[in-house]
């Protein structure tokens, strides 16, 4: 009779995470008894997987009833794969005796899993940014294998090409992991944009994962001002309003100030939203001419989002009749200590 | 069904000669190594011949020499051909599959008494 | 030759009991051992094979343990059909030898 060959027909098994995976193993001849071995790696370090003979592998089952001493296949089942499976497994036969001995191997079957990365996560800048700035974006997936994979980076629908992509680690690995980072230029309608990080696998059919960022959480637009006044019914008697207009976030603290001094304070509230996401806010002051001997400058201070404060300043003339007029001047630290002022917001 | 059926035994005077059979069924018979274990009357189990699927034979040093195994695939039998028998050698034989992949005997006959006596 | 020591030879036990019985190479088998029950009159019958798997259809009352030189066979709950008596086999390394043999009775 010719001597028994181990053949293992696979050279290589790809399975899916989750799934198991069978791997096949005939001996060409009953004898010499002898128990199958499986291992996965060769060489003295090799882990064994299977013993025909002896203990107790729970995820492994043999596909025949390999007990059996007319059985010739000694394919096995491995159950619930993970990437941590993947290698190259040998199918040995071994001689009876005080101790079993290796008679022969098969050629070995390299198993590969295919492992879905796990769903993008973009996070952005710590700190919030204003239009015309540049900021990074970054993107990680763990967990996939085999490793190629492709990314993908996206504003509001349209692809963005200033990215750096890194898979890790570079050699062989059980499972792999990307790591992206995109810039991505603000503007200042891009409170309602978002940006996509898309990551396609052989393991998603053609359906690519998606992370997602709201460029809301990242941008700062800063209001504009524009203090105005108009007259009121009473001839003695001035409107002067300041307009916040397209700022984002809403959080926003306004104080009037008359010749510098702190006339009200007051927190955007009942703000209007425009369409691109941005924020207007109208306060008004009313101010009695005829308690004012001298000329009133009215600064309106914004403080927005937690930045440095801008300003607005309007010169109210008492001894002319009341006309628009405004400067960007600072507010000053003189000024009269008579008030007999009204305000509200809007 | 897996069976194994003895048969051949009897009385046989020391010195004499006897040919036990065993006819198998229910399983394929040229993949199993077969044996053959004695029993005397009121005594333990005593393994006598084993025949490979190759046709290797092996002995206890009791009967090497005297005894010879043989099998016949075809007619899905098994032979031990008794020579130069002994009072000692008085049991009853039986027939054994070795069918595990370890060659563990697995299924047994219901045996064949051989008595040696003058 | 390989001896196979069986203890104890004989052991009486009741209905219910759990008995061990054990069984010593004189060198190491490498597990190769079978546990065999036989009944007056009848076939001896497999139990377990290579120490410790148990033969197909044996009810798993029957365990075996044990590796090198020394085995033992449990039978966790004694029925009245258990009653027999009990060999243990190497078959490493021809010749194959078995044990004396435990005649296993009721009390």
């Known amino acids: 009779e010719e001597e028994l060959q181990v053949i293992q027909p696979d050279k290589s098994v790809s399975v899916a995470a989750g799934e198991s995976a069978i791997l096949h193993c005939t001996v060409t001849s009953l004898i010499p008894v002898g128990p199958i071995q499986w291992f996965r790696g060769a060489g003295p370090a090799r882990e064994l997987i299977y013993n025909q003979k002896e203990g107790h592998f729970p995820r492994v089952t043999t596909v025949s009833e390999s007990t059996k001493r007319e059985n010739m296949d000694f394919s096995i089942s491995i159950s619930n794969i993970t990437p941590a499976d993947a290698g190259t497994y040998y199918c040995v036969k071994f001689r009876k005796g005080s101790p079993d001995t290796e008679f022969k191997s098969g050629a070995g079957t390299e198993l590969s899993v295919r492992a879905k990365p796990s769903a993008p996560v973009v996070s952005g800048p710590a700190a919030r940014a204003t239009p015309q700035h540049t900021v990074s974006f970054t993107c990680e997936s763990h967990g996939f294998s085999p490793r190629d994979i492709t990314l993908k980076w996206f504003k509001n629908g349209n692809e963005l090409s200033d990215f750096q992509t890194n898979v890790d680690p570079v050699g062989e690995s059980v499972s792999y992991s990307i790591h992206s980072t995109a810039k991505v230029v603000l503007t200042r309608e891009d409170v309602h944009s978002q940006v996509i990080c898309e990551v396609a696998h052989v393991t998603l059919q053609g359906d690519p994962l998606r992370g997602t960022a709201n460029l809301s959480e990242t941008i700062r637009v800063p209001p504009t001002l524009e203090v105005t006044q108009q007259p009121v019914r009473a001839e003695n008697q001035v409107n002067v309003t300041c307009q916040v207009r397209k700022f984002y976030p809403q959080r926003l603290q306004l104080t009037w100030l008359e010749n510098g001094n702190v006339s009200r304070t007051e927190t955007a509230s009942t703000v209007t939203e425009n369409k691109d996401g941005t924020y207007n806010w109208m306060s008004w002051l009313l101010v009695n001419v005829s308690a004012h001997r001298d000329d009133v400058k009215l600064t309106c201070q914004v403080e927005h989002d937690g930045q440095p404060a801008v300003s607005k300043s309007h010169d109210l003339k008492v001894s002319a009749h009341p006309k628009e007029q405004g400067s960007n001047t600072a507010a000053e630290n003189t000024g009269s200590n008579e008030r007999n002022i009204y305000g509200g917001s809007g | 069904e897996v069976q194994l059926v003895e048969s051949g035994g009897g009385l046989v005077q020391p010195g004499g000669s006897l040919r036990l059979s065993c006819a198998a069924s229910g399983f394929t018979f040229s993949s199993f190594d077969m044996h053959w274990v004695r029993q005397p009357t009121g005594k333990g189990l005593e393994w006598v011949s084993t025949?490979?699927?190759?046709?290797?034979?092996y002995f206890p040093g009791s009967v090497k020499g005297r005894f010879t195994i043989s099998r016949e695939n075809a007619k899905n039998s098994l032979y031990l051909q008794m020579n130069s028998l002994r009072a000692g050698d008085t049991a009853v034989y039986y027939c054994a599959r070795g069918g595990n992949w370890d060659d563990a005997l697995d299924i047994w006959g219901q045996g064949t008494m051989v008595t040696v006596s003058s | 030759d390989i001896q196979m020591t069986q203890s104890p030879s004989s052991l009486s036990a009741s209905v219910g009991d759990r008995v061990t019985i054990t069984c010593r190479a004189s060198?190491?088998?490498?597990?190769?051992l079978a546990w065999f029950q036989q009944k007056p009159g009848k076939a001896p019958k497999s139990l377990i094979y290579?120490?410790?798997s148990l033969q197909s259809g044996v009810p798993s009352k029957f365990s075996g343990s044990g590796s090198g030189t020394d085995f033992t066979l449990t039978i966790s709950s004694l029925q009245p059909e258990d009653f027999a008596t009990y060999y243990c086999?190497?078959?490493?390394?021809?010749?194959?030898?078995f044990g004396q043999g435990t005649k296993l009775e009721i009390k």
């Open positions: 086999q190497q078959y490493n390394t021809y010749p194959y030898t």
């Open positions: 290579t120490a410790s």
């Open positions: 060198q190491d088998i490498n597990n190769y």
């Open positions: 025949i490979g699927i190759a046709g290797d034979t």
